[in-house]
């Protein structure tokens, strides 16, 4: 391991569509991948009239967008489905939304998901 880098070996797993996809609904997912590639965790969610609905959480393959991110933060402005990724075991347990505005200061909408 490179000093200062959080290696990801497992992530929080959640699938809102678990019955249709024939998976578990929630748990811990071990992350697999090429030994030399980095692994990450992700979270996806929707904001339905101010109510947070988690879609999926799990492992994410090597992605430079996720490098050195210890927190799972969506920065895209008003996406249809929110997505964030991070490095470090279970780093996707909490996720938040900090849109990058071009002119105004970014606003903070931290999200702590309720357990299903």
């Amino acid at each position: 391991a490179i000093l200062g880098r959080s290696e990801t070996q497992e992530c929080l797993f959640f699938n809102a569509n678990w019955e249709k996809d024939r998976t578990n609904q929630t748990g811990v997912e071990p992350c697999y991948g090429d030994k030399d590639k980095r692994r990450h965790c992700f979270a996806t969610w929707k904001n339905i009239s101010g109510s947070i609905e988690i879609v999926k959480q799990g492992c994410w393959l090597d992605d430079i967008n996720c490098y050195d991110r210890t927190d799972c933060v969506e920065k895209k402005d008003s996406p249809e489905v929110y997505f964030c990724c991070c490095e470090g075991n279970m780093c996707n347990e909490k996720f938040s939304y900090f849109p990058e505005m071009e002119v105004t200061q970014p606003t903070s909408n931290p999200v702590t998901p309720k357990p299903p």
Epitope: T44, V55, G58, C59, L61, I64, V81, F83
Partner: antibody, heavy 115, light 111 residues
């Protein structure tokens, strides 16, 4: 083992649309991106765009903006690329590739546009 | 993003070393370690050889190596073999906020 299997060759008339599929297996489909790349006969590789397989978020090359649509169906681990208003210079082999590094590629789908 | 610049062709004899360059700008190749190299044999799909400038993809021979200096990335193949004859493309990571771009390709001939 990781595999991306694409749909078969297509022949289309100018002005028509084509939809190419890319079925993934051997890994968790929703754990990365699917990129689409094309290669005209005797030419180089051209990046068309990408789709995040879990969120459905897309980014398209400027050249194809307004003409390309990338979608996916998580339940069958399949990504799709639809190109509309086809012209003769869209004749090419279309590839899907896994992840931001393009570490696995489909076998390619030849799309021929001819009147 | 404009295409990356590669030489159209390079050649070498078996056992020799060759280097293929890929020149971009300070805002792509110069700024990030996200250049990749692909090998493509005629009629086949491309194959990832090097990613992140210098990391060898799993299963790729250690005769292939990648490096970067300034705005130029390079692929070096040492101990050339007949099966190395192919087209080679450089390209960038694509996904999230990063848009992909490829070089024009370099035809490697093993004499």
């Amino acid at each position: 083992q990781v595999q991306l299997v694409q749909s078969g060759a297509e022949v289309k008339k100018p002005g028509a649309s084509v939809k190419v599929s890319c079925k993934a297996s051997g890994y968790t489909f929703t754990s990365s991106y699917i990129n689409w790349v094309r290669q005209a006969p005797g030419q180089g590789l051209e990046w068309m765009g990408t789709i995040n397989a879990v969120s459905g978020s897309t980014s398209y090359a400027q050249k194809f903006q307004g003409r390309v649509t990338m979608t996916r169906d998580e339940s069958i681990s399949t990504a799709y690329m639809e190109l509309s208003r086809l012209r003769s210079d869209d004749t090419a082999v279309y590839y899907c590739a896994r992840g931001g590094w393009f570490d696995y590629w489909g076998q390619g789908t030849l799309v021929t546009v001819s009147s | 993003q404009s295409a990356l610049t590669q030489p159209a062709s390079v050649s070498g004899s078996p056992g020799q070393s060759i280097t293929i360059s890929c020149t971009g700008t300070s805002s792509d190749v110069g700024s990030y370690n996200y250049v990749n190299w692909y090998q493509q044999h005629p009629g086949k799909a491309p194959k990832l050889m090097i990613y992140g400038v210098s990391k060898r993809e799993s299963g790729v021979s250690n005769r292939f190596s990648g490096s970067k200096s300034g705005n130029t990335a390079s692929l070096t193949i040492s101990g050339l073999q007949a099966e190395d004859e192919a087209d080679y493309y450089c390209g960038t990571f694509a996904g999230g906020k990063y848009y992909g771009v490829f070089g024009g390709g370099t035809k490697l001939t093993v004499l």
